[in-house]
């Protein structure tokens, strides 16, 4: 079959090869499209409601005055010339619609380095077939799920026209010390070949570099974290940042079920209080930051306590404050 692509709403003429140029003609068109149930036969005599959709012209060609999505399918013509020789024509018709120029909506004017940011949402309306949206950074294609790039896509179909609306939301994590004014654009690639991509106007958000946080200091009293049974340990979490962040406490890597407080008092220490404690400062703008961990231990009378109760600063691990 010969592949034919036709733009929605435009006329289409399909030639019936081998047909005499003028009547009388012995020919028949067979259609299997979205408008038909199995095969529909059209003859030069025509007439009836089909004439508004497709009719046979005097030269035997099939004329569709305005192609629609339902006209996609197979068109066959069987013609016999004056000498009785039979010729068959076979067409596979596909339709398309070029959407309006895609647009970036809800675009960010500023991104924060080192954390995921929504750049914007690319919208293309009125395509057929659906086609695809892709993002570009400084003219180069961005690959989702690589280097802090994620894309959330949505495709909707108009209930009446059957045309597609595509949406693509771009999230990126700009590298610290990277380009302070990256250029993002989005392009629509049609679902049918031989049609060029349509590109949005570019956007150039600023990249803001957060000032590195000063370290969260965990102060233990008594120093070293070793205490006699029944003694009291006071843990204080010192964060230089303003405004003061929320401070939660961890024991052995697990959040303690307490409200935020910069001070944790452990009175009358018993064996069950022994363990590794740390504090987590949660800033509204930076996310959680954990202190070094300190080891709280009980020293029996006559024992020498360790000189330092700290263990290496642990990462956040599976931090999920309820």
């Amino acid at each position: 079959a010969q592949n034919i692509t036709a733009r929605i709403g435009e006329p289409l003429v399909l030639k019936c090869k081998g047909a005499p140029k003028k009547p009388p003609q012995r020919l028949e068109w067979k259609l299997n499209t979205g408008r038909t149930e199995a095969w529909k036969v059209l003859s030069p005599q025509g007439g009836g409601p089909w004439d508004s959709v497709a009719r046979v012209l005097p030269n035997g060609s099939l004329f569709l005055p305005a192609v629609g999505i339902q006209d996609e399918g197979i068109f066959r013509c069987q013609a016999m010339n004056r000498n009785g020789k039979e010729t068959k024509s076979n067409y596979r018709v596909r339709v398309y619609q070029i959407p309006g120029k895609p647009e970036i909506v809800d675009s960010a004017s500023e991104l924060t380095a080192g954390v995921p940011n929504k750049v914007g949402t690319c919208v293309s309306e009125g395509s057929y077939p659906a086609g695809t949206l892709s993002w570009h950074l400084d003219g180069k294609p961005l690959v989702p799920n690589e280097k802090g790039v994620s894309v959330k896509e949505q495709t909707r179909r108009h209930p009446e026209t059957g045309l597609f609306t595509l949406q693509s939301e771009l999230m990126v994590t700009p590298a610290r010390g990277g380009d302070p004014r990256p250029t993002f654009s989005c392009s629509f690639s049609p679902g049918l070949p031989r049609h060029r991509a349509l590109r949005t106007a570019p956007i150039q958000p600023r990249v803001w570099e957060p000032v590195p946080l000063e370290e969260v200091q965990l102060v233990v009293e008594p120093e070293g974290g070793a205490v006699a049974p029944g003694g009291t340990v006071t843990l204080t979490c010192e964060v230089p940042a303003q405004p003061s962040p929320q401070i939660h406490w961890m024991k052995d890597g697990v959040p303690l079920p307490l409200p935020p407080s910069p001070v944790l008092i452990l009175p009358e220490i018993g064996p069950q209080d022994q363990g590794t404690y740390s504090c987590v400062a949660t800033h509204s703008s930076h996310g959680p930051q954990e202190s070094r961990a300190v080891s709280i231990s009980i020293i029996e009378p006559g024992e020498e306590g360790p000189t330092a109760g700290s263990v290496g600063g642990s990462g956040l691990g599976t931090l999920a404050l309820a």
Epitope: W249, L256, P257, P259, S261, V263, I265, A320, A322
Partner: antibody
Amino acid sequence: EIQLQQTGPELVKPGASVKISCKASGYSFTDYIMLWVKQSHGKSLEWIGNINPYYGSTFYNLKFKGKATLTVDKSSSTAYMQLNSLTSEDSAVYYCARSDYWYFDVWGAGTTVTVSS
Amino acid sequence: QAVVTQESALTTSPGETVTLTCRSSTGAVTTSNYANWVQEKPDHLFTGLIGGTNNRSPGVPARFSGSLIGDKAALTITGAQTEDEAIYFCALWYSNHLVFGGGTKLTVL
């Protein structure tokens, strides 16, 4: 509807132990702290301790350390409190309450524990 | 250990505004005490009203509000109703220790 269903009244002998339960329904059990509170007859409320059902981590009022043990069973969305070495001082109504660290919005109906020989 | 003090009893009339307070023996109550207010009705029916000083629990009528007044935590009922007759407990967090007040018996006549 969010509910905390507690076990019925308990009559126990001095020196014995009792384990009371608090079954949560209508919300995600592991998303909230469970808080336990004691109300002695004619007295105010006393905080016993908290448990984080997600991790099983606990924190106790010093007064109840060694007296109360808090546990959870995530599969049945149930929190438990065991009270050991019971004396007449432990006769009270015990409540569980759902908390998101600083709120206690939903409370159980309470479990009355009577310690008597 | 800190002591939390409340009015032992208050009386109001329907439609009136009434304020219950909660004082700390350690000094001024601040937002770091996460003041809570809990209502007890007959038959040991407890409901959390306010948490974190001024956050109303879901489903609690808007006539209940929490605040700090001077150096105390306060619960204000604007337009009291007869069904608000109950005992109201406040609770304050002190770092990692929770202390309840003695409760205020509110009568709505």
